[in-house]
Interface confidence: low
């Protein structure tokens, strides 16, 4: 039910090329296509070059996407596009120009000298942003999530895009400098995530990260479940990132008992962060299910 | 033939450390993931932790955190254990296991 | 931590005799994704152990198939349908679903 046909504006097709391109990289991934019929893996990349032929469309000439050309640039989904066609590259053939083109915009256009990224025109589906609706820490939230899409894109673009070491230290910095006065585990997780990828989630910090977690086993704010599925995928990633595998078991185990299978509205950002997660964790951690299987932890064919 | 080589007894002074290896043959290395585990004299099996070849990544059983550290080298398809602060209640056979098990090395403590 | 409970401590048979081991777990071995990580070893006198069977009941290469195991969630049982000589030694049990792993205390099968 994740291989959808994208259709839309510049939005819309993002909402409905993210469930096939997480879909196609988890079963690449944890090499389960056996499962679903081999066949069915050309189908599912033929939908995502149509998404992604559609959404050059709505490429404006400073290289940004909005939901229409006309409208203002959004800062969140150019970032948004940035992440899901670096996952993207290695399933089909993504101009690099487009995607760092982005990055580029990303950096010169949207990041204050502090190291936060704005956003002057919002997307009209709020429901795609997932956690970041009515964020109260937008600065860390949005910040942490354009540098976690900066980081996917750092081997594509770095030669392309001079700044981009630059920018990414500077975000960090912000995130850093700031990340012991938040209150919301969502906020917590994203930005953990961001860091740990920088390898800036130690001492206090670590230990805040850690200490958010309810029951050593989610990140959960009062309100919506799919926001929390989120976070919790971001916490995952920053574990697996963090290389200390003692804490992942009971936050896969508590991913997993949501029986979250992506799909339907505002699912966007959990459905693309649950798969990223778990996809990443049968791939790194030494874990249960493939210990005492023995089973050989196959690198991705491709 | 699939093997783990272990290296060989040691005998050292108690609070010294000790680094013993555990060399895979016969198959793809980074395939399997490493256990380690301790047998005391004519003792039960105690799991200390594993490794992820692959990236490098541990799980160890809380009661021998700060005691085991586990480690890798792709390169020669080798993975180490060092035990620190060593005493007499060290003083066992370890084995490595993925899921073949090494012939164990045994470690004596003792002024 | 899962305690594992073997019983008999030992065993004493006669070749070309059955043998039955148990091993009682704290905790359901029952995993999230529907599978049981329980796993059988033996060592031999003065060697390293060797697995014999994983996921309850699967059988490693070139293991005899005089070898079963059997059980679910707490309850699991090793059986050996004719004891040779080479099966003498220590058999544990180990569960690979909870961390930290956790092994039985072994159970010594003697040749009588």
């Known amino acids: 039910h994740l291989i959808v046909t994208p259709s839309g504006c510049g939005e819309q097709n993002m909402i409905g090329m993210t469930p096939t391109v997480i879909a196609v990289h988890y079963l690449d991934e944890t090499e389960q296509w056996e499962k679903f019929g081999l066949e069915k893996r050309q189908g599912a990349l033929e939908l995502i070059k149509k998404g992604y032929t559609q959404q050059l469309a709505f490429r404006q000439p400073s290289s940004a996407f909005a939901a229409f050309v006309k409208r203002a640039p959004s800062t969140w989904l150019t970032a948004y596009v940035v992440k899901v066609f670096s996952l993207a590259v290695n399933l089909i053939a993504i101009d690099s120009q487009v995607l760092c083109g982005a990055v580029k915009w990303l950096i010169l256009e949207k990041q204050k000298p502090d190291g936060v990224f704005q956003e002057d025109a919002p997307v009209i589906h709020q429901e795609m942003i997932g956690g970041l609706r009515n964020n109260n820490e937008k600065d860390m939230a949005l910040t942490a999530f354009v540098l976690i899409s900066l980081q996917e894109a750092k081997d594509i673009c770095e030669e392309q895009v001079n700044s981009l070491p630059g920018s990414i230290t500077k975000a960090g910095d912000f995130l850093e400098a700031n990340y012991m006065n938040l209150q919301r585990s969502y906020t917590v997780a994203i930005a953990g995530y961001a860091l740990a990828q920088m390898g800036r989630l130690k001492g206090p910090l670590l230990n805040k990260f850690l200490t958010t977690a309810k029951d050593k086993n989610r990140w959960e704010d009062p309100g919506k479940q799919l926001y929390n599925v989120e976070a919790t995928s971001y916490a995952l990633l920053a574990l697996l990132q963090l290389k200390d595998f003692d804490f992942v078991p009971p936050v896969v185990r508590w991913l997993n008992e949501q029986r979250y299978y992506g799909g339907g509205y505002g699912s966007t950002q959990a459905t693309f962060m649950v798969f990223q997660a778990l996809a990443q964790y049968q791939k790194d951690a030494p874990d249960h299910q493939e210990l005492n299987l023995d089973v050989s932890l196959q690198l991705p064919s491709r | 033939e699939v093997q783990l080589q272990q290296s060989g007894p040691v005998l050292v002074k108690p609070g010294a450390s000790v680094k013993m290896s555990c060399k895979a043959s016969?198959?793809?290395?980074?395939?399997?993931?490493i256990n380690w585990v301790k047998q005391s004299h004519g003792k039960s099996l105690e799991w200390i932790g594993v490794i992820n070849p692959y990236n490098g990544g541990t799980s160890y059983n809380q009661k021998f955190k700060g005691k085991a550290t586990l480690t890798v080298d792709k390169s020669s398809s080798t993975a180490y254990m060092e035990l620190n602060s060593l005493t007499s209640e060290d003083s066992a056979v370890y084995f490595c296991?993925?899921?073949?098990w090494g012939q164990g090395t045994s470690v004596t403590v003792s002024s | 931590d899962v305690l594992m409970t073997q019983t008999p401590l030992t065993l004493s048979v006669t070749i070309g005799q059955p043998a039955s081991i148990s091993c009682k777990s704290s905790q359901s071995l029952l995993d999230s994704d529907g599978k049981t990580y329980l796993n059988w070893l033996l060592q031999r006198p003065g060697q390293s152990p060797k697995r014999l069977i994983y996921l309850v009941s699967k059988l490693d290469s070139g293991v005899p198939d005089r070898f079963t195991g059997s059980g679910s969630g707490t309850d699991f049982t090793l059986k050996i349908s004719r004891v040779e000589a080479e099966d003498l030694g220590v058999y544990y049990c180990?569960?690979?679903?909870?961390?930290?792993?956790?092994f039985g205390g072994g159970t010594k099968l003697e040749i009588k």
């Open positions: 180990w569960q690979g679903t909870h961390f930290p792993r956790t």
């Open positions: 296991s993925s899921p073949y």
């Open positions: 016969g198959y793809t290395f980074t395939n399997y993931y």
